[in-house]
């Protein structure tokens, strides 16, 4: 692994890192000493390689020459060659291979099942709240609020099909217009991409593996976020998706058809139904405003029921409310009428673990969440280990070549489109984009699939899940056929539009570059991956939802300044990169800002301290606070006296200078004390401050 992962792939020339960093640096390779380069003003400067303290964090990158962590690793075969084995060894090898294959299938099965249980767990924990999000009709007319509701609900129930079916029901019963449903569908599309990002977190053990896995997973996120960024305002302004789907529905006459085949469910259901079974209708009823559903449990108790239609006497406010004039009477106190009521008779209980436990939904949800995450993690580790032992040498070469090699010229461009079709087909077969992308994540991590190939496969998966929805819509009853079909088509055309935006022209494949950038950051600062997940999928949508509750003026009042600030930063960064000369000296880099505002290093130190503090039996809070203050204000050499007796052996001295306790030993820390603010990094021609700067 390269010494500075967050800078790898940052520039076509890996040696062109720092301009004008003063003072000697111990780790300059001999071959680079003495070489010179001209800076913006034309004066020659020493070309120096970057130390860990001078690392730059950028999301938009170009592949470097030389040692590139994004290059697929060589999966070497360390075992005995086939020709060198005796017949007993060959038989043993064959059995071993079969055994590994069976184990691989077994773990893959458990992995998919745990994803299903994870979804159920999320629904038990947050399903009712998710339903309540939908029941707030007034907010949903606001497209931004609709978008974040879609994100939140899908994140909470871990299933875009659940949120989509709720939307369909609401549109069918006129609780929601198609226009208001489109942003929610966009949000659901974003929300569904969290699953494989969670799966990628499980691969945090190896930095390079994690870099690839996390980038491979977040390429889906970036595609969805960027698509929404462009298509939501476009839809709000032109309503093109609504008009296009209306046109499609009017042009073709759709008849009720067959639902998509549930191939994966057929295999996984026998197992997952032994663990938990949910009554999905409860969330739907809450969303539809049924107050009684709030008290119902999501856990399915009765699996076999008989419905009997019986005549039941019910009270009505007055004779005018009677169902039929001939069946209407008063007992002197209440007015009664006869109604046909479908009564459910419970026949047989379900066969899952929790059927006889009188535990609340939340408790069962938390148990299942913990267990499914542990199984998911365990399965991933085992899958990665098994794949690692299977994919060696010749086998690896064949698989990697098959998956990652393009068609011969001039048909190379077709390869990606074939990958999109493969992704769509595979998703259609497994009936879940989450399952497909999650299964792909460890393969990206271990280097079997490149990010460049994973991207079209993911896009195809997005298409696949919408074709499934279209088939499901065609199989829906007559009263919901049109609305469910229109929503499924909106989802389909949204993804098609996204692909047209971010795939055909290689230059526009921003999600790959952004995902790689995020992979670099997360590889160095693994906590950032968790922060990213919480920030983008929970905090941001919740904040926007909260502001939406307050009304349009508040949302605009808070949102516009934030958007303007982001645009200002982007513009400033572009100017710093392209034509820094037009900027005042102070604005040519980010040094004018406090370190914590443009570098992750201080934050890493805080988190490292917090975690180490948490691990100790006794947290010396005063000392920690002192260190934190020193780091936040950027003063690297202040000393914090001990406020309590430290039980650990390594800290015997009375006073210690503040030392970075991050994941990397920072040998340049003392250097940074002397030369703080002098180092600058140029990445992609953009001048940016060192210390893993965010800008």
């Amino acid at each position: 692994m390269a010494p500075w992962p967050e800078l790898e792939n940052a520039h076509p020339n890996p040696n062109k890192f720092i301009e004008g960093a003063s003072g000697p640096q111990s780790s300059i390779p001999d071959k680079d000493k003495g070489t010179s380069k001209t800076n913006d003003s034309g004066t020659p400067v020493a070309k120096i390689e970057l130390l860990p303290s001078y690392s730059a964090l950028v999301l938009i990158e170009e592949p470097p020459e030389g040692n590139d962590p994004w290059d697929l690793p060589e999966l070497q075969d360390n075992g005995i060659k086939w020709s060198e084995r005796d017949s007993k060894g060959k038989i043993l090898c064959i059995f071993q291979g079969i055994g590994k294959f069976i184990l691989l299938l077994g773990f893959l099965y458990l992995f998919v099942c745990s994803l299903d249980v994870l979804s159920s767990a999320f629904q038990l924990v947050g399903g009712k709240m998710a339903g309540q999000f939908f029941s707030n009709n007034s907010i949903m007319s606001n497209p931004v609020a609709g978008l974040v509701i879609g994100v939140l609900v899908t994140v909470m129930v871990q299933s875009s099909s659940t949120s989509s079916s709720i939307i369909v029901s609401m549109v069918a019963s006129s609780l929601l217009s198609v226009r208001a449903a489109i942003p929610i569908i966009m949000g659901a599309n974003i929300g569904t991409s969290i699953t494989n990002t969670i799966v990628a977190l499980m691969q945090a053990g190896d930095r390079n593996e994690f870099r690839r896995a996390f980038a491979g997973a977040t390429v889906h996120d970036f595609f969805n976020w960027l698509s929404v960024l462009v298509l939501l305002p476009l839809e709000a302004a032109t309503h093109y998706l609504e008009k296009l789907t209306n046109l499609v529905l009017e042009t073709f006459s759709f008849q009720n058809g067959e639902d998509a085949p549930d191939i994966l469910k057929v295999i996984t259901d026998p197992f997952t139904k032994l663990i938990i079974q949910l009554d999905k209708k409860v969330i739907q009823q809450i969303a539809m405003g049924d107050s009684e559903a709030q008290n119902k449990s999501l856990i399915k108790i009765w699996c076999k029921t008989i419905s009997n239609v019986i005549e039941e006497n019910v009270t009505v406010p007055s004779p005018d409310n009677c169902t039929s004039p001939s069946y209407c009477w008063t007992d002197g106190i209440q007015t009664w009428t006869i109604q046909n009521v479908t009564e459910k008779e419970n026949i047989a209980k379900c066969q899952h673990i929790f059927v006889n436990f009188s535990l609340p939904d939340l408790a069962v949800g938390i148990i299942l969440l913990t267990v499914s995450l542990l199984i998911l993690c365990g399965c991933l580790i085992m899958i990665v280990k098994l794949l690692g032992s299977v994919l060696r040498g010749q086998v690896a070469t064949v698989i990697k070549k098959t998956l990652n090699t393009d068609f011969p010229f001039p048909f190379a461009w077709l390869t990606g489109y074939l990958a999109i079709l493969v992704g769509a087909g595979m998703t259609f077969i497994v009936q879940s984009s989450s399952v497909f992308t999650s299964a792909m994540t460890p393969l990206i991590g271990i280097g079997v699939i490149s990010i460049e190939r994973a991207y079209p496969l993911t896009l195809g998966s997005n298409i696949g899940t919408t074709t499934t929805a279209i088939l499901a819509a065609l199989a829906s009853p007559g009263n919901t056929l049109r609305s469910s079909l229109q929503i499924a088509l909106c989802h389909f055309f949204f993804n098609i539009s996204g692909i047209l935006l971010w795939y055909p022209i290689p230059f526009t494949r921003l999600p790959i570059r952004l995902a790689k950038g995020l992979g670099n950051i997360s590889a160095k600062y693994r906590w950032f991956a968790v922060f990213y997940l919480i920030f983008f999928f929970l905090l941001t949508p919740l904040t926007v939802f909260g502001l939406s509750l307050a009304g349009w003026p508040v949302l605009v009042g808070v949102g516009v300044p934030i958007i303007l600030l982001i645009l200002l930063v982007l513009c400033l960064r572009m100017l710093q990169a392209r034509c820094p000369r037009i900027l005042p000296l102070k604005l040519r880099d980010w040094n004018f800002l406090p370190l914590w505002m443009h570098s992750l290093k201080p934050w890493d130190n805080i988190i490292s301290l917090a975690t180490s503090c948490f691990q100790r039996r006794c947290c010396c809070c005063c000392r920690v606070c002192c260190r934190v203050c020193c780091m936040v204000c950027g003063c690297k050499c202040c000393r914090c006296s001990k406020c309590c007796k430290n039980l650990e052996e390594e800290e015997k001295e009375q006073d210690v200078p503040v030392k970075a306790s991050g994941g990397f030993d920072n040998t340049a820390m003392s250097k940074e004390c002397q030369d703080e603010g002098k180092g600058q990094v140029e990445v992609l021609g953009m001048k940016a401050l060192s210390n893993t700067t965010v800008f």
Epitope: N313, T315, P319, P325, S326, Y327, C328, W329, T330, D331, G332, I333, Q334, T335, W336
Partner: antibody, heavy 120, light 107 residues
Framework: QVQLVQSGAEVKKPGSSVKVSCKTS????????IHWVRQAPGQGLEWIGG????????NYKQNFRGRVTLTADKSTSTAYMELSSLRSEDTAVYYC?????????????WGQGTTVTVSS | DIQVTQSPSSLSTSVGDRVTITCTAS??????VAWYQQKPGKSPKLLIY???TRHTGVPERFTGSGSGTDFTLTISSVQPEDVATYFC?????????FGVGTKVEIK
């Protein structure tokens, strides 16, 4: 068997109050509504009001509102009717009758009646 | 309130005769009509409810019919024990209202 047994005859002065009881047996008191009907000498039947003993919900005929109070004691399966500000025209036989709650079978059992005479 | 008009107010008949008593409501009451029998010095007894349903223990000679505003109680073959006053009652809306009654006598 089903029984509705009413209290004995009452002779009251104008302006006073009368409380008639109706003790029931042979059925689930809370599953029925207890109605009160009166019959002036040589006249037809006039509905006064009714009570649902299960939840004490009552309803009265407009011209009795404010003068009549219907109550029920679930523990003894007894219903009561109290009529205040008695006038001579309140002289009548007062009946209690049961009506199966949520059913359209009307007043299927009646008490034997309580004669209330209002005279100065 | 719904007014209920009963006719005749009284009638004299012979044993074995067929007797018809009519009841008219001031507005549509569907089939929410009941018929009661009150023998002299006794409390009323339910005969027919829901316009045509005989109450348990009521002889088959008593039949009820009608819907909307016009209803009839028919005694197919009058017996000596049928001497009583017959009341109809509507229970479509509150307040519950009764007819003035029809007095049946035997010659």
């Amino acid at each position: 068997q089903v029984q509705l047994v009413q209290s004995g005859a009452e002779v009251k002065k104008p302006g006073s109050s009368v409380k008639v009881s109706c003790k029931t047996s042979g059925f689930f008191f809370t599953e029925y509504i207890i109605h009160w009907v009166r019959q002036a000498p040589g006249q037809g039947l006039e509905w006064i009001g009714g009570i649902i003993p299960n939840n004490d919900v009552t309803n009265y005929k407009q011209n009795f509102r404010g003068r009549v109070t219907l109550t029920a004691d679930k523990s003894t399966s007894t219903a009561y009717m109290e009529l205040s500000s008695l006038r001579s025209e309140d002289t009548a036989v007062y009946y209690c009758a049961r009506w199966r709650n949520a059913y359209y079978s009307a007043m299927d059992s009646w008490g034997q009646g309580t004669t209330v005479t209002v005279s100065s | 309130d719904i007014q209920v008009t009963q006719s005749p107010s009284s009638l004299s008949t012979s044993v074995g005769d067929r007797v018809t008593i009519t009841c008219t409501a001031s507005q549509d009451v569907g089939t929410a009509v009941a018929w009661y029998q009150q023998k002299p010095g006794k409390s009323p007894k339910l005969l027919i409810y829901w316009a045509s349903t005989r109450h348990t223990g009521v002889p088959e000679r008593f039949t009820g019919s009608g819907s909307g505003t016009d209803f009839t109680l028919t005694i197919s073959s009058v017996q000596p024990e049928d001497v009583a006053t017959y009341f109809c009652q509507q229970y479509r809306t509150s307040p519950l209202t009764f007819g003035v009654g029809t007095k049946v006598e035997i010659k």
